[in-house]
């Protein structure tokens, strides 16, 4: 009987998760005489196969990061190999799984900030990439400061924009940073995928060395 997994030759789209071991057929095309066999062409990548009887399947796990959409064509052939139906487009959309970890572009960043700089104004950006689909949580990155050294009175002088990786001073940092007292700081920054919301997220860390420079601007005397 015709149904979800079998039917006549017509344009179709299928969505398959990447990374899954091939476990079932994609579709069973039905031949109408004089068609006796089927032919598959297009972006098969030697993964997609159609058997003589019209059984379309894949023989190894897909990888969205290699190809996110496979554009295939299926034709029905007669007993002389001549196309009697089609070719029709068959689109395989490869759905993303979280199979890639975010990675900082640099293992170490260096920057400088002037004392009394405006809080919230970025003076340095850290940047990570993730090969997973940015339209899904798998590729949505979340930055945070893990450690600030030194940490004086348990006060954070630096903050990071969780989405953009922009580092700036906190209000306390703007008021209290003094190169005469502490000319340099080190931050350990982490990035997580899944928007930072899952225990199953992947993460990476990087080190940021920050030099505090003196504010040479003096208020004019009255």
């Amino acid at each position: 009987q015709e149904g979800k997994f079998s039917g006549p030759l017509k344009p179709m789209t299928f969505s398959i998760y990447e990374g899954q071991e091939p476990s079932q057929i994609i579709f069973q095309f039905k031949a109408n005489p004089p068609a006796v066999t089927f032919e598959l062409t297009g972006e098969t990548d030697n993964i997609f196969v159609i058997e003589r009887e019209g059984l379309l399947y894949y023989n190894r796990a897909l990888d969205r990061e290699t190809r996110s959409t496979h554009n295939l064509q299926v034709a029905a052939l007669d007993a002389n190999g001549i196309i009697v139906e089609g070719p029709v487009p068959i689109t395989i959309k490869v759905k993303d799984i979280n199979d890639n970890r975010p990675t900082f572009l640099q293992s170490k960043y260096e920057g400088s900030v002037r004392q009394n700089s405006r809080p919230g104004k970025p003076f340095l950006y850290v940047n990570a990439t993730d090969l997973d689909d940015p339209a899904t949580p798998n590729g949505q990155l979340y930055y945070q400061i893990v450690i600030q050294l030194p940490m004086i009175n348990n006060v954070m002088y630096f903050q990071i924009n969780n989405k953009t990786g922009a580092i700036s001073l906190t209000r306390e940092g703007s008021q209290e940073l003094n190169p005469a007292k502490n000319p340099s700081y080190n931050l350990v920054i982490s990035v997580k995928d899944m928007g930072g919301q899952s225990e199953n997220s992947f993460s990476d860390t990087t080190s940021v060395d920050i030099i505090v420079t003196e504010n040479i601007w003096k208020a004019p005397k009255p």
């Epitope: 004089p34 006796v36 007993a79 190999g81 001549i82 196309i83």
Partner: antibody, heavy 119, light 112 residues
């Protein structure tokens, strides 16, 4: 080895019919199509049509479709081509040929049957 | 119908010399699967046709490797690297991309 053996020469009068046979051996008869091609004296080759012995499906050249019938007898692995309403310009050598499934080419031809149409 | 045009129609060749036969189709015989549906065969005097080349460039089983086929979607060439006496006969190209199958007029190869 694979062979196609055709019936002997025929002499026919205009308006009559002729039925040429082609006996296959050395392979599974129902696996491959049998085609008929003719060659008039001093002329080129002309494809007449084919039959698929597995299901009896036929396709004919439009030029012959009203006058030709192709059949098979799978019990004897024999293909037949009947041409009706013969005219003098049907005088030709008629060949059967096996079209190799999956490789898609004529790999074996019969020896040919001469059909002469003359009053 | 697809028209197949061969040239030359007659080809006198000295044994041991190369020979080349051209065939042109009125429509591309290249299909999206990458195959070109052109077939070359030889009809020796008084004999049935015999296959030489299938799908433009594939040498059929038992055919000497002095025969080769090449071409594009519409222009095809059959080459014989060194002609031998046994190669005489009429050479035909044929398309089987679509029905009706159609043939070239034939090229008669003869020994000088």
């Amino acid at each position: 080895q694979v062979q196609l053996v055709q019936s002997g020469a025929e002499v026919k009068k205009p308006g009559a019919s002729v039925k040429v046979s082609c006996k296959a051996s050395g392979y599974t008869f129902t696996d491959h199509t049998i085609h008929w091609v003719r060659q008039a004296p001093g002329q080129g080759l002309e494809w007449m049509g084919y039959i698929y012995p597995r299901d009896g499906y036929t396709k004919y050249n439009e030029k012959f479709k009203d006058r030709v019938t192709m059949t098979t007898d799978t019990s004897t692995s024999t293909a037949y081509m009947e041409l009706r309403s013969l005219r003098s310009d049907d005088t030709a050598v008629y060949y059967c040929a096996r079209f190799y499934y999956g490789y898609w080419y004529f790999d074996v031809w019969g020896q040919g049957t001469t059909v002469t149409v003359s009053s | 119908d697809i028209v197949m045009t061969q040239s030359p129609l007659s080809l006198p060749v000295t044994p041991g010399e190369p020979a080349s036969i051209s065939c042109r189709s009125s429509k591309s015989l290249l299909r999206s699967n990458g195959n070109t549906y052109l077939y070359w065969f030889l009809q020796k005097p008084g004999q049935s046709p015999q296959v030489l080349i299938y799908r433009m460039s594939n040498l059929a089983s038992g055919v000497p490797d002095r025969f080769s086929g090449s071409g594009s979607g519409t222009d095809f060439t059959l080459k014989i690297s060194r002609v031998e006496a046994e190669d005489v006969g009429v050479y035909y190209c044929m398309q089987h991309l679509e029905y009706p199958f159609t043939f070239g007029q034939g090229t008669k190869l003869e020994i000088k």
